[in-house]
């Protein structure tokens, strides 16, 4: 039940999983000048039972020049995810009523890991998109994608998001930018996704979406 493809690529957006379904694999990749230790794992695997899920195996990198040094995993704050995860995320919340059993949290970084994480997702995984800094989103619906099994094949659903440059003024009919003032923000009928910490963004929808992007007045 591994997903055949990667989640959809949305120009100028990054995606992130809030948690990873059991069966997800994360490649043990090292940054340039480093390599996996000889007996090291090829990947970490999210495994678990009904009450607890965790990552099996540890990724360890050693200098390509050295023979015997092994580097231990050093837990740090939450890190970048597959395909350059955004800087827009806040730290994970502790386990609470919205946690998903059978899912692992983001694994802590290991020393000298590669800059990009490569995950192999499983059916049922949901990922969430945000526009990168300097781009805005126009909203029409949720900016999320799920890996589904349909007729024996896996596919990712299309997130309702596209990101446009901050300076671009093109908007869909009826769509307005969010205001700076706390009260009376105009509505953006084309559903949108988005954001980083403080700057505001909007986005347009791809014309290939399920419903016409010119309709956000939902009848």
């Amino acid at each position: 039940e591994l997903c055949d493809d990667d989640p959809p690529e949305i120009p100028h957006a990054t995606f992130k999983a809030m948690a990873y379904k059991e069966g997800t694999m994360l490649n043990c990749e090292c940054k340039r000048g480093f390599r996996r230790i000889k007996s090291g794992s090829l990947y970490m695997l999210c495994t678990g039972n009904s009450s607890h899920s965790s990552w099996d195996n540890q990724c360890q990198c050693t200098s390509s020049a050295t023979r015997n040094t092994t580097k231990q995993v050093t837990p740090q704050p939450e890190e970048q995810k597959e395909r350059k995860t955004t800087e827009m995320q806040s730290p994970m919340q502790p386990v609470d009523q919205a946690s998903l059993p059978g899912h692992c949290r983001e694994p802590p970084p290991w020393e000298n890991e590669a800059t990009e994480r490569i995950y192999h997702f499983v059916v049922g995984q949901m990922v969430y998109y945000q526009c990168v800094q300097g781009y805005r989103a126009l909203h029409r619906g949720p900016a999320e994608s799920v890996c589904k099994m349909t007729h024996g094949k896996t596919r990712w659903t299309q997130p309702q998001l596209i990101c446009t440059g901050e300076m671009e003024t093109s908007q869909f009919p009826g769509e307005e930018k969010p205001q700076a003032s706390p009260e009376g923000r105009p509505e953006s009928e084309t559903s949108c996704l988005v954001t980083t910490t403080d700057f505001q963004i909007q986005t347009e929808m791809a014309a290939t979406m399920e419903t016409s992007i010119f309709t956000t007045e939902y009848q």
């Epitope: 992130k16 809030m18 989103a137 909203h139 900016a143 799920v146 769509e175 969010p178 105009p186 988005v194």
Partner: antibody, heavy 119, light 106 residues
Framework: QVQLKESGPGLVAPSQSLSITCTVS????????VYWVRQPPGKGLEWLGV???????TYNSTLKSRLTISKDNSKSQVFLKVNSLQTDDTAMYYC?????????????WGQGTLVTVSA | KIVLSQSPAILSASPGEKVTMTCRAS?????MHWYQQKPGSSPKPWIQ???NLAFGVPSRFSGSGSGTSYSLTISRVEAEDAATYYC?????????FGSGTKLEMK
């Protein structure tokens, strides 16, 4: 700990406006969307609208002309305003946060605030 | 507009029974979320994206479905499961809730 709490007037006269504040903690409004949902007594859930993390909004088309959703990220507050109230606007009003960024699964809910529209 | 029709509206079951409630969409959608609500309480997140159980949801619950038909199944009903269950989608516009299935104990 993620928390949302609605505060409203309780009783509102017909034709007046309703303003409800949702005060949140444990997360940033600039990162997650907040939805508004209401439930008339003894009835089902009705989606009112959403304010996305960037501050733009999407509304239920049947109520759109009467609704305004806004927020103040710095105060961690989201606001719902409903104009021209009628008796059938009597309901429990909930704000809810998504599980992931601008997602669609409402993973955290406030306790709700009951609004009665009556003369 | 996507309409979600839940059936049955009321479901009576005895403890230990297996029950299934259905949510049908008027057009094909990609996934379904579910919530549980008990009288006097806020809705609780129950199932995400068709089949992922929320934290604290007993493993006797499961979700499945595709296209226009989705279901929530309880393998062995317990008294504490008595509640109203709502389906919800926004994989196609607009956001919609189902009308709910009320599960009662016999």
């Amino acid at each position: 700990q993620v928390q949302l709490k609605e505060s409203g007037p309780g009783l509102v006269a017909p034709s007046q406006s309703l303003s409800i504040t949702c005060t949140v903690s444990g997360f940033s409004l600039s990162t997650y969307s907040v939805y508004w949902v209401r439930q008339p007594p003894g009835k089902g859930l009705e989606w009112l609208g959403v304010i996305w993390s960037d501050g733009s909004t999407t509304y239920n088309s049947t109520l759109k002309s009467r609704l305004t959703i806004s927020k103040d990220n710095s105060k961690s507050q989201v606001f719902l305003k409903v104009n021209s109230l009628q008796t059938d606007d009597t309901a429990m009003y909930y704000c809810a946060r998504t599980y992931g960024y601008d997602g669609s699964w409402l993973a955290y809910w406030g306790q709700g605030t009951l609004v009665t529209v009556s003369a | 507009k996507i309409v979600l029709s839940q059936s049955p509206a009321i479901l009576s079951a005895s403890p230990g029974e297996k029950v299934t409630m259905t949510c049908r969409a008027s057009s094909s959608i990609s996934y379904m979320h579910w919530y549980q609500q008990k009288p006097g309480s806020s809705p609780k997140p129950w199932i995400q994206a068709t089949s992922n159980l929320a934290f604290g949801v007993p493993s006797r619950f499961s979700g499945s479905g595709s296209g226009t038909s989705y279901s929530l199944t309880i393998s062995r009903v317990e008294a504490e499961d008595a509640a109203t269950y709502y389906c919800q989608q926004w994989s196609s516009n607009p956001f919609t809730f189902g009308s709910g299935t009320k599960l009662e104990m016999k």
